[in-house]
Amino acid sequence: MAVTACQGLGFVVSLIGIAGIIAATCMDQWSTQDLYNNPVTAVFNYQGLWRSCVRESSGFTECRGYFTLLGLPAMLQAVRALMIVGIVLGAIGLLVSIFALKCIRIGSMEDSAKANMTLTSGIMFIVSGLCAIAGVSVFANMLVTNFWMSTANMYTGMGGMVQTVQTRYTFGAALFVGWVAGGLTLIGGVMMCIACRGLAPEETNYKAVSYHASGHSVAYKPGGFKASTGFGSNTKNKKTYDGGAHTEDELQSYPSKHDYV
């Protein structure tokens, strides 16, 4: 029950996280004009990964897409790539995890296969979350660097007679959405991995009981059955069963030998 809850919760958290990553990637407010300690302009500038926008006091907003690839800063391209990779991995992870959910029965899919898929989706969610966090952090670092550079220009570039409004940019809402979403996806991924650890032993214990019922001589120690619901001693349980460290793939091949006599 706890495994199902952990897996389900991990899925929901990751789903929210990936939706957040998609939202952050599409948002226009990655960087917004810094209004602090600045002559108040009647125009508010903000920028996203795909376009920059200007909102006037009149209420009119005009957005222009970055219609060039080659002319864009390498860092911006890198952030775009990280966010897209995060979305793609997250989407695949969601697809895999739907089939891996313990509460969903698909044909005669074994729990060991579900454990595999849960682990795979968990890893995908973790990488997806890390990609999003990395992307947002790279952009934030770029903003901080530019902010201090333009601040320096504000105080050193006053030599000319004509003053210019130095437009400085600060963190936009999308950065916070991205950080939170990346964190949620990461947490969801970790939960899926934890759920996978709980799924695998239950799977093996089930086989041990079924072997006994079918009259086969079983080399497994029945004592391992008692610990089947616990999360903490899963690796010990595996060793109790037959002294060797088996991969998930090896465990998966057993049913074909014994279960269907």
Epitope: V43, S52, C53, E56, S57, S58, G59, V165
Partner: antibody, heavy 118, light 113 residues
Framework: EVQLQQSGPELVKPGASVKMSCKAS????????MNWVKQKPGQGLEWIGY????????KYNERFKGKATLTSDKSSSTAFMEVSSLTSEDSAVYYC???????????WGQGTSVTVSS | DIVMTQSPSSLTVTVREKVTLSCKSS????????????LTWYQQKPGQPPKLLIY???TRESGVPDRFTGSGSGTDFTLTISSVQAEDLAVYYC?????????FGAGTKLELK
């Protein structure tokens, strides 16, 4: 057709207050910011401030803070400006004007003439 | 506050003459976000409210004759009337609509010779 109809001329005593109106028609009132501009006889234009009828947000020229108060009434699509503690310096024509793309004022009222005299 | 300086203060012209009005701002009106200059030109005839001619320094308002052309960037702007007509005799104001408070120039009065 967009129209901004302003209230009639006012003759007021020094120290008094005057409240003028600007009734908008021909467009959705809450979609556009309304500006107020002062013009003394034979002189140039001076921006007083604006009100956003959508949320009643205002922006004032520091010179007119405490002197002018901008309000609006969505139900009647009317913007108001109250000028208080009137002196001869406040004798002028006051215009309301709609703020448009590029922060330009595209439609103007015909103006309300205020004369401060004892 | 941004100071808008218009020159000349008055100009005597003949019909069909080409006229150039100047407007200088004490601070740049160029917005880096969209590379647009937030300067507006108005025409005011006696006893009438001002009329919008040009916004974004060079964009002609609909219905304004194409003999009116706005140009310039940053701090220096010009309004050109390619062939002055009798109905163009008025006062022309430039306005900063970039930094609060919005400020107007003192105006250039166009008079007939």
């Amino acid at each position: 057709e967009v129209q901004l109809q302003q209230s009639g001329p006012e003759l007021v005593k020094p120290g008094a207050s005057v409240k003028m109106s600007c009734k908008a028609s021909g467009y959705t009132f809450t979609n556009y910011v309304m500006n107020w501009v002062k013009q003394k006889p034979g002189q140039g234009l001076e921006w007083i401030g604006y009100i956003n009828p959508y949320n009643d947000g205002t922006k004032y020229n520091e010179r007119f803070k405490g002197k002018a108060t901008l309000t609006s009434d969505k139900s009647s699509s009317t913007a108001f400006m109250e000028v208080s503690s009137l002196t001869s310096e406040d004798s002028a024509v006051y215009y309301c004007a709609r703020l448009y793309r590029g922060n330009a004022m595209d439609y103007w009222g015909q103006g309300t003439s205020v004369t401060v005299s004892s | 506050d941004i100071v808008m300086t218009q020159s000349p203060s008055s100009l005597t012209v003949t019909v069909r003459e080409k006229v150039t009005l100047s407007c200088k701002s004490s601070q740049s009106l160029l917005n880096s976000g969209n590379q647009k200059n937030y300067l507006t030109w108005y025409q005011q005839k006696p006893g009438q409210p001002p009329k919008l001619l040009i916004y974004w320094a060079s964009t002609r308002e609909s219905g304004v004759p194409d003999r009116f052309t706005g140009s310039g960037s940053g701090t220096d702007f010009t309004l050109t009337i390619s062939s002055v007509q009798a109905e163009d005799l008025a006062v022309y104001y430039c306005q900063n609509v970039y930094i609060y408070p919005f400020t107007f120039g003192a105006g250039t009065k166009l008079e007939l010779k």
